[in-house]
């Protein structure tokens, strides 16, 4: 449905002098009153005009009036200096009514034909104003047939008078500690008929300070105090103002955390208004003095409510509140002028007593028991039997509270057992089974399970043995009774070890030959290394050069001796390596199945027999001396041989350890 009044009936028509187009009579007076609908005006023009000309049109005339105003008095045919004829002019009513009066006097010197005029109602464009006139609307004017309406820009609302735009300037709340506020449109003239309210609301403890800046221009009166437009400032303590005129008001220190600013304007005037810059202050907190070995940040001239500072300690010092360490420290100034937390201390970092090093010791370098920042300690391993793995053992107490090595490691160094040490200098000469002396075979391990077997100690928590020797216990590792550090099989004086897990080579098939006859036992605890318990070395890549045909290896164990009984004392035998083809051929004939000797085996013994390992020796190490490192290494594991140990033309067969180095290393590193 269209807005505005009901569509009006058309208003238009014709007017003419009496008798037109003939001459008009004397002493005539005719009056027409034309009315247009509200919001419309009347337009009138003449198509014919012929009246007697007289000075100031005193005799005959047509008078056009709109309300009380005479629009024109017309006579003659053409305008003169003092008289006006309509010519082609168009006349408009000022409002919606137009009065037309025609008068003729008592005589005419000659005949005159009078006038003809046409009129019509047309819409008034109220939005069009003459220069110098006040605009119809404050902001936007919208004309329509029969009327107009005003609208306002965003942030304003149309006043009840339907023309003025009042500013929507109430309810603004300022909560920052400083800011600016001004009259609407500043520095352009402020709006009329507006009532603005601004609130500054800070946390309790703050005090607002108001400064009028730049310019101040609010409509005033010479005698009465701010009767038209005014600015008032209200706090919970007092009221300031009203303010008007052109003088900047003085600074106002409100001593309050809440301020309400009211600005009221009337319907007239053209003034630029005001601008306020506000700040705040509060009761300052005591100046923070940094603790020794610390500093304050940020550094300020003063600290007031909500201001904060942090304490940072110098490298090597840590924050302590009382006796408790702090990760960080920040204090905030409160409304009563006190800090919310007491000042902490910066205390020298203490790394604490260093951890004990298994199989090693620690020495305080800086001073006895000194464990504070930059203190130095020295770890070392127990001489002879342990060596430190890739580390110089020097640790420094660093700022993070950790003992740290020169390589930046925080973990302890590792004392690795020295391998391959023996009281024996060399084998060299071939001779029969001999009794071992203390320290000759410190890697020798006695394994008691279902049967008697042997093994060799690797590192300080692994035993290398033959798969067939521990196969029955692979799922019951704890059933293995592992003994070391003794020469006598039945002696009560030995070091006891227990198995945590048994790892049998996945290529070993029980009761189907002896290929891949190798196993590892993980001990549940590390053993202490000494002259009687020392691990055997694993072969280096270059070890094959010490294991050629006729090179001497040494086998040791408590297995069957020539007398057919298990040895009471650890025995050993020095035996040469046998050519692989020769050994393969020796086991080609019955009762041995073809292919008994594989590339994963090596053979050792005398062609004439008499020197061999035997039942009970299984799993023990066949060792060789690495003349370059002067360490003994395991080349073979006692695996199998002829039915009759030491038989002529037959040889002892050993698992070739060098083929299994990756397997051994993988198991040990994974577990």
């Amino acid at each position: 449905t269209p807005l505005g009044p009901k569509w009006p009936e058309p208003v238009f028509g014709r007017l003419a002098s009496p008798g037109f187009p003939g001459e008009y009579a004397n002493d005539q007076e005719r009056r027409w009153t034309l009315t247009a609908p509200p919001g419309y005006r009347l337009r009138l023009y003449f198509t014919h005009f012929d009246l007697e000309l007289s000075h100031l049109c005193e005799y005959d005339f047509v008078k056009l009036s709109s309300g009380a105003k005479v629009l024109a008095t017309l006579c003659g045919q053409e305008s003169t200096d003092t008289e006006r004829a309509p010519g082609k002019d168009t006349f408009y009513s000022l409002g919606s009514s137009l009065d037309i009066t025609f008068r003729s006097d008592y005589s005419n010197e000659k005949p005159f034909t009078g006038f003809e005029a046409f009129y019509a109602a047309e819409d008034i464009d109220e939005c069009q104003v003459a220069p110098g006139e006040a605009p119809t609307c404050d902001h936007h004017c919208h004309n329509h047939l029969g009327g107009f309406y005003c609208s306002c820009r965003a942030g304003y609302v149309l006043h009840r008078n339907k023309r003025t735009c009042s500013a929507l300037c109430s309810g603004q709340v300022f909560t920052q500690r400083s800011g600016e506020l001004s009259s609407p449109e500043y520095p352009r003239p402020y709006p009329k008929l507006s009532s603005c309210t601004y609130s500054i609301s800070l946390e309790e403890g703050f005090s607002v300070i108001l400064d009028f800046v730049e310019s101040f221009d609010v409509e005033t009166h010479p005698e009465t105090l701010c009767p038209y437009d005014f600015l008032k400032i209200q706090t919970d303590r007092e009221e300031h103002g009203p303010f008007c005129g052109k003088t900047l008001p003085h600074r106002i220190e409100t001593k309050s955390n809440t301020v309400t600013i009211t600005f009221v304007t009337d319907e007239s005037g053209d003034h630029t208004g005001w601008k306020i810059h506000y700040t705040s202050t509060a009761q300052p907190c005591p100046y923070p003095m940094a603790p020794p070995n610390g500093h304050v940040s940020p550094v300020q001239a003063k600290y007031i409510l909500k201001d904060s500072f942090s304490i940072f300690c110098e490298t090597g010092y840590e924050l302590l509140q009382g006796h408790l360490p702090l990760k960080s420290f920040t204090a905030v100034c409160q409304k009563d002028g006190s800090w919310d937390r007491p000042m902490p201390a910066c205390s020298i970092v203490d790394c604490g007593p260093p951890d004990d090093l298994p199989s090693g010791r620690v020495e305080y370098i800086t001073g006895p028991g000194v464990t504070t920042y930059k203190a130095v300690i020295q770890y070392s391993c127990e001489e002879t039997f342990y060596t430190m793995k890739v580390n110089d053992g020097k640790y420094v107490c660093e700022a993070d509270g950790f003992w740290t090595s020169s390589k930046g490691e925080k973990s302890l160094p590792v004392c690795e057992p020295v391998c391959g040490l023996s009281a024996r200098t060399t084998g060299g000469r071939i001779y029969g089974g001999q009794k071992a002396k203390p320290g000759d075979f410190p890697w020798q391990v006695l394994i008691l399970g279902g049967t008697t077997a042997a093994g060799a100690l690797l590192y300080d928590n692994w035993v290398l043995t033959a798969a067939h020797a521990v196969y029955e216990q692979k799922h019951d590792a704890s059933a293995l009774d592992i003994r070391m550090g003794t020469l006598k099989r039945l002696s009560p004086h030995y070091t006891q070890a227990w198995s945590e897990a048994v790892f049998i080579h996945e290529g070993y098939t029980h009761d189907a030959g002896f290929d891949n006859d190798i196993a590892l036992i993980k001990l549940n605890n590390k053993v202490v290394i000494n002259s009687n318990i020392t691990p055997i070395c694993l072969p280096r890549k270059e070890a094959e050069s010490f294991m050629r045909t006729d090179d001497i290896g040494t086998a040791s164990g408590w297995g069957l001796t020539q007398r057919g009984f298990l040895a009471r004392n650890l025995m050993y035998v020095d035996i040469p390596i046998v050519d692989h083809q020769k050994c393969t051929a020796a086991y080609e004939k019955p009762p041995y199945p073809r292919g008994s000797v594989t590339a994963n085996m090596l053979c050792a013994g005398l062609e004439s027999g008499g020197k061999d390992s035997c039942r009970g020796d299984a799993g023990g190490a066949l060792v060789f001396l690495d003349s370059e490192t002067e360490r003994w290494f395991v080349g073979g594991i006692v695996s199998w041989g002829s039915m009759n140990c030491g038989e002529a033309g037959q040889y002892g067969v050993y698992t070739k350890v060098i083929n299994y180095i990756p397997w051994i290393e993988n198991i040990i590193s994974d577990f």
Epitope: L320, Q321, G322, H323, L324, P325, L326, R341, G352
Partner: antibody, heavy 118, light 107 residues
Framework: QVTLKESGPVLVKPTETLTLTCTVS??????????VSWIRQPPGKALEWLAH???????SYRTSLKSRLTISKDTSKNQVVLTMTNMDPVDTATYYC??????????WGQGTLVTVSS | QPVLTQPPSVSVSPGQTASITCSGD??????AYWYQQKPGHSPVLVIY???KRPSGIPGRFSGSNSGNTATLTISGTQAMDEADYYC?????????FGTGTKVTVLA
């Protein structure tokens, strides 16, 4: 060798006051940045800190129990005493004393079970 | 009293890594401490000041703390690590313990 040992009644009646004593050895209650804390653990529940006292005599209490707790130390006897007034069956718990060093509670007593029942 | 929230339980296979979280408002701004408690025993400090290990605590225990969460990590978990674990932090000068997490090492 650092040790702490709690002693006190095994059974307390409701409304009564509990007094627990912690006797320490292996460290000093008067020197160093050390403190002693009391912690309790109701059966089958989590640990609950109660109070602590440092060598400087600085004390602190659990907010919700502040009005009922008092901690003190007797340096000459190497003892820390905790009293807890107006005992209630919900206070039934194992009460531990423990040493504080560098913010960590690094040595604990074996604990004493206190039952509150009429 | 502020609240430190832990998952009630965590299960892990032997040799695998167990992670226990402890959540609290701005916990990363404070130091976190971790305790292990086995049934019938007193708690044992395993990590102090977020990531430091006391003497005698195995290297498989490690800690971290940032944002709102502290984490205790047990790498290569062993059967003997089955226990209740509690986090703890200091709020001003009062100690706050976590709700506790039961770590189960699967057979």
């Amino acid at each position: 060798q650092v040790t702490l040992k709690e002693s006190g009644p095994v059974l307390v009646k409701p409304t009564e006051t509990l007094t627990l004593t912690c006797t320490v050895s292996g460290f000093s209650l008067s020197r160093g940045k050390m403190g002693v804390s009391w912690i309790r653990q109701p059966p089958g529940k989590a640990l609950e800190w109660l109070a602590h006292i440092f060598s400087s005599d600085e004390k602190s209490y659990r907010t919700s129990l502040k009005s009922r707790l008092t901690i003190s130390k007797d340096t000459s006897k190497n003892q820390v005493v905790l009293t807890m007034t107006n005992m209630d069956p919900v206070d039934t718990a194992t009460y531990y004393c423990a040493r504080i060093r560098r913010g960590g509670i690094d040595y604990w007593g074996q604990g004493t079970l206190v039952t509150v029942s009429s | 009293q502020p609240v430190l929230t832990q998952p009630p339980s965590v299960s892990v296979s032997p040799g695998q890594t167990a992670s226990i979280t402890c959540s609290g408002d701005k916990l990363g701004d404070k130091f976190a401490y971790w305790y292990q408690q086995k049934p019938g025993h007193s708690p044992v400090l395993v990590i102090y000041q977020d990531n430091k290990r006391p003497s005698g605590i195995p290297g498989r225990f490690s800690g971290s703390n940032s944002g709102n969460t502290a984490t205790l990590t047990i790498s290569g978990t062993q059967a003997m690590d089955e226990a209740d674990y509690y986090c703890q932090a200091w709020d001003s000068s009062t100690a706050v313990f976590g709700t506790g997490t039961k770590v189960t090492v699967l057979a």
